[in-house]
């Protein structure tokens, strides 16, 4: 996880410690680098990255996705709605990141780093959103049953699920990064 200590969200703190905005930006880019490494292993190991059968696996998943109504795109941008969506989405991704933990051989540490860095990112964003409405967290029981269901899939579906999680998480973070730069 990139270094950084607490500092103010509003106004301009000194160079050390890192500002809230810089920590968030660096953290997202760090996670995106980790996802790239994991995607490399996934694509080398199977042909999932070229598969046209993604829809079969996507039916079993409810991965967070940015939509117009979330206010994170240039068209219809709404910073408060968007920030809530980013945090909510990251919280929803946590169960899928937990699923990824046993899915990698050579990149096991990288998968753990992505998971832990995401937790840190959520904390950074929650500080930035401290004046916004309460953010709903996913139900642990629902997450536990989803995890069990995903782990019970056959090998092909598990490989496809891994590929889809990484692709969706990358897209979600890229959209988040663009939006957060305005905030």
């Amino acid at each position: 996880v990139p270094p950084g200590e607490d500092s103010k969200d509003v106004a301009a703190p000194h160079r050390q410690p890192l500002t809230s905005s810089e920590r968030i930006d660096k953290q997202i880019r760090y996670i995106l680098d980790g996802i790239s490494a994991l995607r490399k292993e996934t694509c080398n190991k199977s042909n999932m990255c070229e598969s046209s059968k993604e829809a079969l696996a996507e039916n079993n998943l409810n991965l967070p996705k940015m939509a117009e109504k979330d206010g994170c795109f240039q068209s219809g941008f709404n910073e408060e709605t968007c920030l809530v969506k980013i945090i909510t989405g990251l919280l929803e991704f946590e169960v899928y990141l937990e699923y990824l933990q046993n899915r990698f051989e050579s990149s096991e540490e990288q998968a753990r780093a992505v998971q832990m860095s995401t937790k840190v990112l959520i904390q950074f964003l929650q500080k930035k959103a401290k004046n916004l409405d309460a953010i709903t967290t996913p139900d642990p029981t629902t997450n536990a049953s989803l995890l069990t269901k995903l782990q019970a899939q056959n090998q092909w579906l598990q490989d496809m699920t891994t590929h889809l999680i990484l692709r969706s998480f990358k897209e979600f973070l890229q959209s988040s990064l663009r939006a957060l730069r305005q905030m």
């Epitope: 509003v10 810089e22 219809g76 910073e79």
Partner: antibody, heavy 119, light 106 residues
Framework: EVQLVESGGGLVQPGGSLRLSCAAS????????MSWVRQAPGKGLEWVAK????????YYSDTVTGRFTFSLDTSKSTAYLQMNSLRAEDTAVYYC????????????WGQGTLVTVSS | DIQLTQSPSSLSASVGDRVTITCSAK?????MYWYQQKPGKAPKLLIY???NLASGVPSRFSGSGSGTDFTLTISSLQPEDFATYYC?????????FGQGTKVEIK
């Protein structure tokens, strides 16, 4: 044509106040963060402040914190810089600038308005 | 705040010359930008995020570098390129600028 037009500059005494305006046209104002950057006569550029598109977050340079306030009126596509307790060293051309969507670059700048603080 | 040092402070060059301006930071920066400013005018964005050419900027301008050392290159200087060039960085607030490099006609 995409443009920003600053106004409100002028001569003011030390300790006085001034409000600068930045009117945007030719683009949808609402998704963009805005910044003010100033340039003292014959000197380089100095970033002053930023405001997020909805005004929820503001950032200021140490030199103006507590004296300047950045605000928006999105219905008028206008940004404002309220400058209080002005000092001689605040004398500069003040530019407002739009932040490129999805990046930190300041891509569109106004022509600037001159603020002179002198007795 | 991150201090940026541009070199040279000024240079004289002829039309067609290849011109290189450098910008050094005391510590690593996240994003670097380059601007052109002509007398009495607002700065104009040339390069963003180290090496991306801004919309409408001629391809003779290019940016490179990472970490603490960055370069703006004008491959073949044109008459309209005589101006002052500034580097600017973002690594959290505040944004900071270099002191400028004035490109004059030899």
């Amino acid at each position: 044509e995409v443009q920003l037009v600053e106004s409100g500059g002028g001569l003011v005494q030390p300790g006085g106040s001034l409000r600068l305006s930045c009117a945007a046209s030719g683009f949808t104002f609402s998704p963009f963060a805005m910044s003010w950057v100033r340039q003292a006569p014959g000197k380089g550029l100095e970033w002053v402040a930023k405001i997020s598109p909805g005004g929820s977050w503001t950032y200021y340079s140490d030199t103006v914190t507590g004296r300047f306030t950045f605000s928006l009126d999105t219905s008028k596509s206008t940004a404002y810089l309220q400058m209080n307790s002005l000092r001689a060293e605040d004398t500069a051309v003040y530019y407002c600038a739009r932040q490129l969507w999805g990046y930190y670059a300041l891509d569109i700048w106004g022509q600037g308005t001159l603020v002179t603080v002198s007795s | 705040d991150i201090q940026l040092t541009q070199s040279p402070s000024s240079l004289s060059a002829s039309v067609g010359d290849r011109v290189t301006i450098t910008c050094s930071a005391k510590i690593s920066v996240s994003y670097m930008y380059w601007y052109q400013q002509k007398p009495g005018k607002a700065p104009k964005l040339l390069i963003y995020d180290m090496s991306n050419l801004a919309s409408g900027v001629p391809s003779r301008f290019s940016g490179s570098g990472s970490g603490t050392d960055f370069t703006l290159t004008i491959s073949s200087l044109q008459p309209e390129d005589f101006a002052t060039y500034y580097c600017m960085q973002w690594s959290g607030y505040p944004y900071t600028f270099g002191q400028g490099t004035k490109v004059e006609i030899k």
